[in-house]
Interface confidence: medium
Protein backbone atom coordinates (compact mmCIF):
# COMPACT_ATOMS: atom_id res chain seq x y z
CA UNK A 1 0.00 0.00 0.00
CA UNK A 2 1.23 3.51 -0.88
CA UNK A 3 0.79 5.84 2.12
CA UNK A 4 1.51 9.02 0.14
CA UNK A 5 -2.11 10.26 0.12
CA UNK A 6 -2.87 9.80 3.82
CA UNK A 7 -4.05 12.71 5.95
CA UNK A 8 -0.88 12.86 8.03
CA UNK A 9 -2.03 15.59 10.42
CA UNK A 10 -5.15 13.64 11.40
CA UNK A 11 -3.09 10.49 11.93
CA UNK A 12 -0.67 12.51 14.05
CA UNK A 13 -3.58 13.83 16.15
CA UNK A 14 -4.88 10.29 16.70
CA UNK A 15 -1.39 9.16 17.71
CA UNK A 16 -0.93 12.01 20.19
CA UNK A 17 -4.40 11.63 21.72
CA UNK A 18 -4.56 7.88 22.18
CA UNK A 19 -2.11 5.56 20.38
CA UNK A 20 0.94 7.00 22.16
CA UNK A 21 -0.62 6.29 25.56
CA UNK A 22 -1.28 2.67 24.61
CA UNK A 23 2.34 2.23 23.51
CA UNK A 24 3.53 3.65 26.84
CA UNK A 25 1.18 1.31 28.72
CA UNK A 26 2.52 -1.68 26.77
CA UNK A 27 6.10 -0.67 27.60
CA UNK A 28 5.42 0.08 31.28
CA UNK A 29 8.10 -1.34 33.51
CA UNK A 30 10.71 -1.17 30.76
CA UNK A 31 13.56 1.37 30.91
CA UNK A 32 13.54 3.79 27.98
CA UNK A 33 17.25 3.07 27.40
CA UNK A 34 16.80 -0.69 27.34
CA UNK A 35 16.51 -1.01 23.56
CA UNK A 36 18.44 0.68 20.75
CA UNK A 37 16.44 2.06 17.84
CA UNK A 38 17.57 0.15 14.78
CA UNK A 39 14.62 0.88 12.48
CA UNK A 40 14.35 4.34 10.95
CA UNK A 41 12.25 6.15 8.36
CA UNK A 42 12.93 9.12 6.09
CA UNK A 43 9.52 10.71 5.53
CA UNK A 44 5.92 10.29 6.61
CA UNK A 45 4.81 7.73 3.98
CA UNK A 46 7.97 5.72 4.68
CA UNK A 47 7.34 5.94 8.44
CA UNK A 48 3.79 4.61 8.00
CA UNK A 49 5.10 1.77 5.83
CA UNK A 50 7.54 0.78 8.58
CA UNK A 51 4.91 1.26 11.31
CA UNK A 52 2.46 -0.98 9.47
CA UNK A 53 5.11 -3.64 8.91
CA UNK A 54 6.29 -3.72 12.53
CA UNK A 55 2.75 -3.56 13.94
CA UNK A 56 0.96 -6.12 11.79
CA UNK A 57 3.54 -8.51 10.32
CA UNK A 58 4.45 -11.36 12.69
CA UNK A 59 8.19 -11.62 13.32
CA UNK A 60 10.38 -14.28 14.86
CA UNK A 61 9.83 -14.10 18.59
CA UNK A 62 6.84 -11.74 18.41
CA UNK A 63 3.72 -12.92 16.64
CA UNK A 64 1.12 -11.22 18.81
CA UNK A 65 1.10 -7.41 18.39
CA UNK A 66 -1.84 -7.15 15.98
CA UNK A 67 -4.43 -7.68 18.73
CA UNK A 68 -2.97 -5.07 21.09
CA UNK A 69 -4.98 -1.90 21.62
CA UNK A 70 -2.36 0.35 20.01
CA UNK A 71 -2.36 -1.88 16.93
CA UNK A 72 -6.14 -1.81 16.61
CA UNK A 73 -6.16 1.98 16.88
CA UNK A 74 -3.33 2.23 14.37
CA UNK A 75 -5.33 0.12 11.92
CA UNK A 76 -8.39 2.29 12.50
CA UNK A 77 -6.39 5.47 11.86
CA UNK A 78 -4.93 4.09 8.64
CA UNK A 79 -8.34 2.86 7.48
CA UNK A 80 -9.95 6.23 8.17
CA UNK A 81 -7.28 8.61 6.85
CA UNK A 82 -5.50 6.65 4.12
CA UNK A 83 -7.77 6.40 1.04
CA UNK A 84 -8.28 2.81 -0.06
CA UNK A 85 -6.37 1.29 2.85
CA UNK A 86 -9.39 -0.44 4.40
CA UNK A 87 -10.15 -2.20 1.11
CA UNK A 88 -6.62 -3.61 0.98
CA UNK A 89 -7.02 -4.90 4.54
CA UNK A 90 -10.37 -6.72 4.35
CA UNK A 91 -8.87 -10.05 3.20
CA UNK A 92 -5.97 -9.72 5.64
CA UNK A 93 -8.45 -9.09 8.47
CA UNK A 94 -10.43 -12.25 7.64
CA UNK A 95 -7.20 -14.26 7.77
CA UNK A 96 -6.17 -12.68 11.06
CA UNK A 97 -9.52 -13.54 12.66
CA UNK A 98 -9.03 -17.19 11.68
CA UNK A 99 -5.61 -17.40 13.35
CA UNK A 100 -6.24 -15.56 16.62
CA UNK A 101 -3.42 -16.26 19.02
CA UNK A 102 -3.12 -15.87 22.76
CA UNK A 103 -1.52 -12.50 23.55
CA UNK A 104 1.99 -13.01 24.95
CA UNK A 105 4.37 -10.20 25.84
CA UNK A 106 7.91 -11.33 25.10
CA UNK A 107 11.16 -9.39 25.29
CA UNK A 108 11.22 -9.43 21.49
CA UNK A 109 7.76 -7.81 21.43
CA UNK A 110 8.91 -5.14 23.88
CA UNK A 111 11.88 -4.42 21.62
CA UNK A 112 9.57 -4.20 18.60
CA UNK A 113 7.21 -1.79 20.35
CA UNK A 114 10.21 0.31 21.38
CA UNK A 115 11.09 0.52 17.67
CA UNK A 116 7.49 1.54 16.95
CA UNK A 117 7.71 4.36 19.46
CA UNK A 118 10.78 5.65 17.64
CA UNK A 119 9.06 5.43 14.26
CA UNK A 120 6.02 7.30 15.54
CA UNK A 121 8.23 10.01 17.05
CA UNK A 122 9.96 10.37 13.69
CA UNK A 123 6.56 10.49 11.92
CA UNK A 124 5.60 13.40 14.16
CA UNK A 125 8.73 15.37 13.25
CA UNK A 126 8.89 15.12 9.46
CA UNK A 127 11.05 18.23 8.96
CA UNK A 128 13.93 16.92 11.06
CA UNK A 129 17.00 15.91 9.07
CA UNK A 130 17.77 12.18 9.16
CA UNK A 131 20.59 11.44 11.62
Amino acid sequence: YDFTNCDFEKIKAAYLSTISKDLITYMSGTKSTEFNNTVSCSNRPHCLTEIQSLTFNPTAGCASLAKEMFAMKTKAALAIWCPGYSETQINATQAMKKRRKRKVTTNKCLEQVSQLQGLWRRFNRPLLKQQ
Partner: nanobody, 114 residues
Framework: EVQLVESGGGLVQPGGSLRLSCAAS????????MGWFRQAPGKERELVSA???????YYADSVKGRFTISADNSKNTAYLQMNSLKPEDTAVYYC????FGTGWGQGTLVTVSS
Protein backbone atom coordinates in the same frame (compact mmCIF):
# COMPACT_ATOMS: atom_id res chain seq x y z
CA GLU B 1 -22.28 -8.67 8.25
CA VAL B 2 -23.32 -6.05 10.80
CA GLN B 3 -26.07 -3.70 9.65
CA LEU B 4 -25.95 -0.15 11.03
CA VAL B 5 -28.97 2.16 11.15
CA GLU B 6 -28.54 5.84 12.04
CA SER B 7 -31.34 8.01 13.48
CA GLY B 8 -31.95 11.19 15.48
CA GLY B 9 -31.15 13.83 12.89
CA GLY B 10 -33.35 16.83 12.18
CA LEU B 11 -33.54 20.59 11.93
CA VAL B 12 -32.18 22.53 14.89
CA GLN B 13 -31.34 26.16 15.57
CA PRO B 14 -27.73 27.29 16.15
CA GLY B 15 -26.79 26.60 19.76
CA GLY B 16 -29.24 23.71 19.98
CA SER B 17 -28.66 20.03 20.68
CA LEU B 18 -29.36 16.67 19.05
CA ARG B 19 -28.61 13.08 20.00
CA LEU B 20 -27.85 10.66 17.18
CA SER B 21 -28.23 6.90 17.59
CA CYS B 22 -26.63 4.08 15.66
CA ALA B 23 -28.29 0.69 16.08
CA ALA B 24 -26.21 -2.35 15.14
CA SER B 25 -27.63 -5.77 14.27
CA UNK B 26 -24.65 -7.49 15.96
CA UNK B 27 -22.63 -6.78 19.08
CA UNK B 28 -21.05 -3.36 18.61
CA UNK B 29 -17.95 -4.28 20.56
CA UNK B 30 -17.41 -7.75 19.15
CA UNK B 31 -14.51 -5.94 17.50
CA UNK B 32 -12.90 -2.75 18.61
CA UNK B 33 -14.13 0.62 17.36
CA MET B 34 -17.14 2.55 16.21
CA GLY B 35 -17.07 5.98 14.65
CA TRP B 36 -19.37 8.78 13.58
CA PHE B 37 -18.59 10.39 10.25
CA ARG B 38 -20.25 13.27 8.45
CA GLN B 39 -20.45 14.51 4.90
CA ALA B 40 -21.50 18.05 4.03
CA PRO B 41 -22.64 18.90 0.49
CA GLY B 42 -19.66 19.10 -1.85
CA LYS B 43 -17.21 17.95 0.83
CA GLU B 44 -15.44 14.70 1.63
CA ARG B 45 -16.67 12.39 4.37
CA GLU B 46 -14.78 13.09 7.61
CA LEU B 47 -14.46 11.38 10.96
CA VAL B 48 -16.20 13.30 13.74
CA SER B 49 -15.63 10.98 16.65
CA ALA B 50 -14.66 7.40 17.49
CA UNK B 51 -14.95 5.17 20.55
CA UNK B 52 -12.77 2.15 21.17
CA UNK B 53 -13.43 -1.05 23.08
CA UNK B 54 -11.19 0.12 25.92
CA UNK B 55 -13.49 3.15 26.37
CA UNK B 56 -11.04 5.69 24.97
CA UNK B 57 -12.37 8.27 22.52
CA TYR B 58 -11.23 10.46 19.65
CA TYR B 59 -12.77 13.77 18.53
CA ALA B 60 -12.07 15.97 15.53
CA ASP B 61 -10.79 19.39 16.58
CA SER B 62 -13.90 21.07 15.17
CA VAL B 63 -16.24 19.26 17.63
CA LYS B 64 -14.08 18.92 20.77
CA GLY B 65 -15.95 20.11 23.85
CA ARG B 66 -19.29 20.12 22.03
CA PHE B 67 -19.86 16.49 20.96
CA THR B 68 -19.75 13.36 23.12
CA ILE B 69 -19.62 9.80 21.81
CA SER B 70 -20.83 6.87 23.89
CA ALA B 71 -21.94 3.28 23.46
CA ASP B 72 -24.35 0.93 25.19
CA ASN B 73 -23.27 -2.61 24.42
CA SER B 74 -26.38 -4.08 26.05
CA LYS B 75 -28.48 -2.27 23.43
CA ASN B 76 -25.93 -2.68 20.61
CA THR B 77 -26.19 1.07 20.09
CA ALA B 78 -23.73 3.94 19.80
CA TYR B 79 -24.66 7.57 20.40
CA LEU B 80 -23.41 11.00 19.46
CA GLN B 81 -24.59 13.80 21.74
CA MET B 82 -24.19 17.08 19.85
CA ASN B 83 -24.41 20.33 21.82
CA SER B 84 -23.83 23.98 20.86
CA LEU B 85 -24.53 23.13 17.24
CA LYS B 86 -23.27 25.47 14.53
CA PRO B 87 -24.39 25.95 10.91
CA GLU B 88 -21.13 24.32 9.78
CA ASP B 89 -22.22 21.10 11.53
CA THR B 90 -24.90 20.70 8.86
CA ALA B 91 -24.25 17.35 7.12
CA VAL B 92 -25.41 13.78 6.72
CA TYR B 93 -24.05 11.79 9.68
CA TYR B 94 -23.06 8.14 9.31
CA CYS B 95 -21.82 5.58 11.78
CA UNK B 96 -19.29 2.89 10.98
CA UNK B 97 -17.84 -0.13 12.74
CA UNK B 98 -14.29 -1.37 12.25
CA UNK B 99 -13.85 -1.59 8.48
CA PHE B 100 -16.19 0.25 6.20
CA GLY B 101 -14.89 -0.56 2.73
CA THR B 102 -18.01 -2.64 2.19
CA GLY B 103 -20.53 0.22 2.17
CA TRP B 104 -22.39 2.71 4.32
CA GLY B 105 -25.87 3.09 5.78
CA GLN B 106 -28.33 5.76 4.72
CA GLY B 107 -27.12 8.20 7.35
CA THR B 108 -29.20 10.82 9.17
CA LEU B 109 -29.41 14.44 8.07
CA VAL B 110 -28.58 17.16 10.57
CA THR B 111 -29.48 20.72 9.54
CA VAL B 112 -28.41 23.63 11.74
CA SER B 113 -30.19 26.79 10.65
CA SER B 114 -32.19 29.65 12.07
Amino acid sequence: EVQLVESGGGLVQPGGSLRLSCAASGSIFSSYWMGWFRQAPGKERELVSAIFSDGSTYYADSVKGRFTISADNSKNTAYLQMNSLKPEDTAVYYCAKDYFGTGWGQGTLVTVSS
